[in-house]
Interface confidence: medium
């Protein structure tokens, strides 16, 4: 067997995708430039990115959204990558807010998160916004990805 | 339109055994995570367990470990538990569904009576 076979690559980037739910979570897609580079790691329920291979992974999102109300009655836009583990329970990995700045129509905005952290077999890890209809789907706009170490 | 259709309810004596199927239809069902939760008479919802889309993972609430098995079969797009041992506790009506759903797309329950 191959040193290859025993490590394979494990990759992942998704696209957004706009959701008629309403659920905070964000939906993903495997469309455009993106990466899935094998069977262990796959997109579930359009929202999750779940890996089969224990080890250290680079996690990593990128959501723009749309400054598009009052700064002064507008609550901060708030990103988090979260960790859903074999045993079910769900975790904030990394969290980031920013101010709405612009009384544009439309200001963008965009919160990068990333991180190196353990994960399990099994394991899943998902993008979760205080206002999904603010996020932006165009064309390199909003990711989320991933690299095993 | 998305359907979930569970079946395989009805009375069993404790320590007996049922076993619940889920049709899916309207989605495509091997891309999805799928669980099962149930609600006893007069409480609120408790998860029992999850598998991943492709059957690899299976996940258990304490209470039903070693008693319960998840499964499921893509080519067919149906959820499975088997329930063995079962106890006057597991009586609850039992639903599948998506973990990230807010209950739009679930189905009406299969009901599960465990009864001397």
């Known amino acids: 067997m191959q040193k290859g076979d025993q490590n394979p690559q494990i990759a992942a980037h998704v696209i957004s995708e706009a959701s008629s739910k309403t659920t905070s979570v964000l939906q993903w897609a495997e469309k455009g430039y993106y990466t899935m580079s094998n069977n262990l790691v796959t997109l579930e329920n359009g929202k999750q990115l779940t890996v089969k291979r224990q080890g250290l992974y680079y996690i990593y999102a990128q959501v723009t959204f749309c400054s598009n109300r009052e700064a002064s009655s507008q609550a901060p836009f708030i990103a988090s990558l979260c960790l859903k583990s074999p045993g079910r329970f769900e975790r904030i990995l990394l969290r980031a807010a920013n101010e709405h700045s612009s009384a544009k129509p439309c200001g963008q905005q965009y919160i990068k998160l990333g991180g190196v952290f353990e994960l399990q077999p099994g394991a899943s890890v998902f993008v979760n916004v205080t206002d999904p209809s603010q996020v932006s789907h165009g064309t390199g706009f909003t990711s989320f990805g991933l690299l095993k170490l | 339109e998305v359907q979930l259709l569970e079946s395989g309810g009805g009375l069993v004596q404790p320590g007996g055994s049922l076993r619940l199927s889920c049709a899916a239809s309207?989605?495509?069902?091997?891309?999805?995570?799928m669980m099962w939760v149930r609600q006893a008479p007069g409480k609120g919802l408790e998860w029992v367990s999850s598998?991943?889309?492709?059957?690899?993972?299976?996940y258990y609430a304490d209470s039903v470990k070693g008693r319960f098995t998840i499964s499921r079969d893509n080519s067919k797009n149906t959820l499975y538990l088997q329930m063995n041992s079962l106890r006057a506790e597991d009586t609850a009506v039992y639903y599948c569904?998506?973990?990230?759903?807010?209950?739009?797309?679930w189905g009406h329950g299969t009901l599960v009576t465990v009864s001397s």
């Open positions: 569904a998506e973990p990230f759903t807010e209950f739009d797309y």
């Open positions: 598998i991943s889309s492709d059957g690899s993972f299976t």
């Open positions: 309207g989605f495509t069902f091997k891309k999805y995570e």
